[in-house]
């Protein structure tokens, strides 16, 4: 299986909400001993590999933000913990999964990693990730709403607040 990022860069004004999105696709083993976890964490542009370092998002770890199920089922976190931090992660039946961040501040700027982990027999893990950058801007240079820049082309797209 693979993970694709729809957008590689999100530029947002302070105070706005944004939804970062990834897509999980490819052959999926729906065996009873296989579980998929989808989650998010912050990272930095590593010298060796992007997303190799992991840090919490607004003090929440990847385990606080994860969705887990077998195959391509829909799921979402409505945990009080995440919502108290202005965060919500969700996924649909088509392999899309996202994290919504509310009331952005400059401190939210940085590299975000989406991750899919396949676990067999509750032991070994196989993982694939995607990366995207969030730039939160303030002042006269900030856009009026979030602008998302596609991963594969230079065309930008205005995205509505979540």
């Amino acid at each position: 299986f693979k993970v694709a990022t729809l957008y590689s860069l999100y530029v947002c004004p302070e105070g706005q909400n944004v939804t970062l999105t990834c897509r999980f696709f490819g052959p999926v083993d729906k065996g009873h001993d296989v579980t998929f976890y989808k989650t998010w964490y912050r990272s930095s542009r590593g010298e060796v590999q992007t997303c190799s370092e992991r840090r919490p998002i607004r003090n929440l770890t990847f385990q606080d933000l994860h969705l887990h199920h077998g195959g391509h089922q829909a799921a979402n976190t409505s945990h009080d913990l995440a919502q108290r931090h202005g965060l919500e992660s969700a996924s649909d039946h088509h392999g899309n999964f996202s994290i919504t961040m509310r009331n952005l501040t400059l401190l939210d700027s940085g590299l975000y990693c989406c991750l899919v982990v396949e676990i067999r027999h509750h032991h070994s893990e196989h993982r694939v990730h995607g990366a995207m950058e969030l730039q939160v801007q303030t002042g006269k240079d900030a856009p009026s709403s979030c602008v998302a820049y596609p991963s594969s082309s230079q065309e930008s797209e205005n995205i509505t607040a979540a």
């Epitope: 676990i119 070994s124 893990e125 196989h126």
Partner: antibody, heavy 121, light 112 residues
Framework: QVQLVQSGAEVKKPGASVKVSCKAS????????INWVRQAPGQGLEWIAR????????YYNEKFKDRATLTVDKSTSTAYMELSSLRSEDTAVYYC??????????????WGQGTTVTVSS | NIMMTQSPATLSVSPGERATLSCKSS????????????LAWYQQKPGQAPRLLIY???TRESGVPDRFSGSGSGTEFTLTISSLQSEDFAVYYC????????FGGGTKVEIK
């Protein structure tokens, strides 16, 4: 740089308990598992247990589940392993080690310097 | 539990020579989903903690000299040190992380 620094050597009597600490620095402590591994004199490595500091959830080798207790103090980025009902065969060097897994198992990329625990009457 | 067996227990080698260390697992540590072998090698010198050398059976950890190489798949693995330096005399452990964690008994590489 990423570092794990352990507490000093301990000498204990049989039946007592020992609590070893492992202080992490240079990375986000809450987001990586901490494992405990021991090595008896002249012997190989034996995995005891691990803990995810973000949640405090711990996972134990069956052999140690009744005697080992793992805890963390997130405010000081410190992990602890307490081993109770000590016997002479628990004499060993105890290591903490970080692993890079998310939900499964992974290799150990960073190790503490080790804490020698001697159990003797 | 997956059992790990290392051989020989002790290997006597002269500096500059090649050392070949063996590790066998009681069941395959190859994961079908990604075709990776969940096996690592560590080096341990007297009075020191183990140090990660190789993971995924053949990937060198950052900073590890290229005279160290890992090979093998499934249940049989080899760590090769192409030309032994004085600092390479140590004990080497293999470690499977496919299903919980188990280590081999170690191979001591000593000066001949």
């Amino acid at each position: 740089q990423v570092q794990l620094v352990q507490s000093g050597a301990e000498v204990k009597k049989p039946g007592a308990s020992v609590k070893v600490s492992c202080k992490a620095s240079g990375y986000s402590f809450t987001d990586y598992y901490i494992n405990w591994v021991r090595q008896a004199p002249g012997q190989g490595l034996e995995w005891i247990a691990r803990i995810f500091p973000g949640s405090g959830n711990a996972y134990y080798n069956e052999k140690f589940k009744d005697r080992a207790t793992l805890t963390v103090d997130k405010s000081t980025s410190t992990a602890y392993m307490e081993l109770s009902s000590l016997r002479s065969e628990d004499t060993a060097v105890y290591y903490c080690a970080r692993d890079d897994s998310f939900y499964g198992y992974w290799y150990f990329d960073v190790w503490g310097q080790g804490t020698t625990v001697t159990v003797s009457s | 539990n997956i059992m790990m067996t290392q051989s020989p227990a002790t290997l006597s080698v002269s500096p500059g020579e090649r050392a070949t260390l063996s590790c066998k697992s009681s069941q395959s540590v190859l994961y079908s989903s990604n075709q990776k072998n969940y096996l690592a090698w560590y080096q341990q010198k007297p009075g020191q903690a183990p140090r990660l050398l190789i993971y995924w059976a053949s990937t060198r950890e950052s900073g590890v000299p290229d005279r160290f190489s890992g090979s093998g798949s499934g249940t049989e693995f080899t760590l090769t040190i192409s030309s032994l330096q004085s600092e390479d005399f140590a004990v080497y452990y293999c470690h499977q992380y496919l299903s919980s964690y188990t280590f081999g008994g170690g191979t001591k590489v000593e000066i001949k």
